[in-house]
Interface confidence: low
């Protein structure tokens, strides 16, 4: 499958439009601070070069690898040293070290201004004036803020973004048509980015084996009628796609994803009965649809797992012959029978089974030793079930905002060293599990909740890795991918934490809070709550509730006042004094 010119091969496979879009995404994900115009210029230069290679694959430099071509192009940026500091040192390296170096400098929390949505008329004018630039800007702004966004999926988002503007800018009420669509794209985009970030962390921090195990479990739940060999083939191909995208090889990734979608649709009879609608869609929609497709029905009369994995006298023989294949078969068989379990729970069960076989297959009587292995699964299954039950009850009792506040207090007490913005962001997202998953019936709650929590806790892990401040966070994040959530759940109040000095400035507010959206105002209040807990980690729920109720009343009162700023200044002093008294500060 060797091509004389890799760049020509990808250009022809993907077409000019997708080629240009993917190169723009790749460059924006590497050089996150570069202006839009600079990236467009680089992309145009690469595209022109690619066209010369399409015309003549033997032309000068056309035989170079994509990493070499793209890296050379990135290293022509004049302000690399001033803008990116030590990242400029990457350019002194040779491939593949140079690309690895660029990857290591990707910033999950780049210091970029928040994207402010202009007025609808302004956006529609910009869209009509230059549709191509408008859509490129969307790709650029998302890619630089989400350096691990799944590139082929971002093309799908851009297609929907374009469709929204095409439809709504002609509507009678543009805003009513457009704004809900943009909100939906924003929320879906954030979720998509976070899910992909976990896949990349899984590959980069825990290796291909960890990712493959995750994929076996998930695909077996989704395609329970497919044979193990079929699932294994899909897992191998999917691993290649995600390894490429997480490694910055976006052209190869998009090309291979298209091939995988094609294969799945050509073989849907042996994969799943749920794929028919997906396979009738155009490429980008098709790939997205397959990735989100509902679980197929389980085959009737599946035999008991115990026969092959506990009762058989050949367990140790089969395990010794091909350990990963045998464990893969165990995971496949268990997962296809349990769409009601989270993927991480299935992986914990597989790990327990592996540990048991490692120990027992070396014992005098292996069968006697591993005969009760399934009994060890019971507490592992019950732990997330109980946790979800308790937290859904709490969510239903409190509602989303107050449930988030309960989690803010809980997590600030566990890891008070973590920065306040990170604690607020992560706890708010953890709190969303309630409205996302608690509405589901029992059989769907655990896969929804625990796999979502894995995604959110990974956000905490990648943000913390950048500026590590807590040994406890590092420990939970690095020891075991599948036990991250239980690790965080098990953390108690950090008794070693020295409370922050009380600083009245931290609780000084101004009239600008009154003009904030409800969401932004909640974030302000939740930020104050985290700071309160950092000052008084031993504060009771009742004490914190009293202070937060006073705070809400204070904001409401001053926002209704004629002289808001004076009210915030005078009433704020009283609030601080009252809070100090209430908390015994």
């Amino acid at each position: 499958d060797a091509h004389k010119s890799e760049v020509a091969h990808r250009f022809k496979d993907l077409g000019e439009e997708n080629f240009k879009a993917l190169v723009l995404i790749a460059f924006a994900q590497y050089l996150q601070q570069c202006p839009f115009e600079d990236h467009v210029k680089l992309v145009n230069e690469v595209t022109e070069f690619a066209k010369t290679c399409v015309a003549d694959e033997s032309a000068e430099n056309c035989d170079k690898s994509l990493h070499t071509l793209f890296g050379d192009k990135l290293c022509t940026v004049a302000t690399l040293r001033e803008t990116y500091g030590e990242m400029a040192d990457c350019c002194a390296k040779q491939e593949p070290e140079r690309n690895e170096c660029f990857l290591q400098h990707k910033d999950d929390n780049p210091n970029l201004p928040r994207l402010v949505r202009p007025e609808v008329d302004v956006m529609c004018t910009a869209f009509h004036d230059n549709e191509e630039t408008f859509l490129k800007k969307y790709l650029y702004e998302i890619a630089r803020r989400h350096p691990y966004f799944y590139a082929p999926e971002l093309l799908f988002f851009a297609k929907r973004y374009k469709a929204a503007f095409t439809e709504c800018c002609q509507a009678a009420d543009k805003a009513a048509c457009l704004l809900p669509k943009l909100d939906e794209l924003r929320d879906e985009g954030k979720a998509s980015s976070a899910k992909q970030r976990l896949k990349c962390a899984s590959l980069q921090k825990f290796g291909e084996r960890a990712f493959k195990a995750w994929a076996v479990a998930r695909l077996s739940q989704r395609f329970p009628k497919a044979e193990f060999a079929e699932v294994s083939k899909l897992v191998t191909d999917l691993t290649k796609v995600h390894t490429e995208c997480c490694h910055g090889d976006l052209l190869e990734c998009a090309d291979d994803r298209a091939d995988l979608a094609k294969y799945i649709c050509e073989n849907q009879d042996s994969i799943s009965s749920k794929l028919k609608e997906c396979c009738e869609k155009p490429l980008l929609e098709k790939s997205h649809c397959i990735a989100e497709v509902e679980n197929d029905e389980m085959p009737a009369d599946l035999p008991s797992l115990a026969a092959d994995f506990v009762e058989s006298k050949d367990v140790c023989k089969n395990y010794a012959e091909a350990k990963d294949v045998f464990l893969g078969m165990f995971l496949y068989e268990y997962a296809r029978r349990h769409p009601d379990y989270s993927v991480v729970l299935l992986l914990r069960l597989a790990k327990t089974y592996e540990t048991t076989l490692e120990k027992c297959c070396a014992a005098a009587d292996p069968h006697e030793c591993y005969a009760k292995v399934f009994d060890e699964f019971k507490p592992l299954v019950e732990e997330p079930q109980n946790l979800i039950k308790q937290n859904c009850e709490l969510f239903e009792q409190l509602g989303e905002y107050k449930f988030q506040n309960a989690l803010l207090v809980r997590y600030t007490k566990k890891v008070p060293q973590v920065s306040t913005p990170t604690l607020v962001e992560v706890s708010r997202n953890l709190g969303k599990v309630g409205s996302k998953c608690c509405k589901h019936p029992e059989a769907k709650r655990m896969p929804c909740a625990e796999d979502y929590l894995s995604v959110v806790l990974n956000q905490l892990c990648v943000l913390h890795e950048k500026t590590p401040v807590s040994d406890r966070v590092t420990k939970c994040c690095t020891e075991s991918l599948v036990n991250r959530r239980p690790c965080f759940s098990a953390l108690e109040v950090d008794e070693t934490y020295v409370p922050k000095e009380f600083n009245a400035e931290t609780f000084t507010f101004h009239a600008d809070i009154c003009t904030l959206s409800e969401k932004e105002r909640q974030i302000k209040k939740q930020t104050a709550l985290v700071e309160l807990v950092k000052h008084k980690p031993k504060a009771t729920k009742e004490q914190l509730k009293a202070v937060m109720d006073d705070f809400a009343a204070f904001v409401e009162k001053c926002c209704k006042a004629d002289d808001k700023e004076t009210c915030f200044a005078e009433e704020g002093k009283k609030l601080v004094a009252a809070s100090q008294a209430a908390l015994g500060l």
């Epitope: 910033d107 210091n111 920065s419 931290t506 000084t508």
Partner: nanobody, 124 residues
């Protein structure tokens, strides 16, 4: 961690103007607020102005309101202080500061990073 470098100080006549600039480098993604403080000989360091880099909020000391304007550029990690209608009492070493919280604090202890300072002298 984060390095701050000020520029733009100097000697100016009363009633004149000066523009101070401060550039942040290093782990700048952690910065939320940037501000200016000043310290006259024999006096404590005092708050002048602060801005929230990721929003548009600003805050000023009463003594400079209407005369000084603070502005931040989040993309470039810079903050500027435009000082107009200067008076001799404005004479001091001016320090740029950066905070990882977003409270527009007046208290110097809320700021984690500091520049070396730049001298501003206003003669009458």
């Amino acid at each position: 961690q984060v390095q701050l470098v000020e520029s733009g100080g100097g000697l100016v006549q009363a009633g004149g103007s000066l523009r101070l600039s401060c550039a942040a480098s290093g782990r700048t993604f952690s910065i939320y607020d940037m501000g200016w403080f000043r310290q006259a000989p024999g006096k404590e360091r005092e708050f002048v102005a602060a801005t929230n880099l990721r929003g548009v909020s600003t805050r000023y000391a009463d003594s400079v309101k209407g005369r000084f304007t603070i502005s931040g550029d989040n993309a470039k990690n810079t903050v500027s202080l435009q000082m107009n209608s200067l008076i001799p009492e404005d004479t001091a070493v001016y320090y740029c500061a950066a905070a990882v919280s977003n409270w527009l604090a007046k208290d110097p202890s809320a700021y984690s990073y500091w520049g070396q300072g730049t001298q501003v002298t206003v003669s009458s």
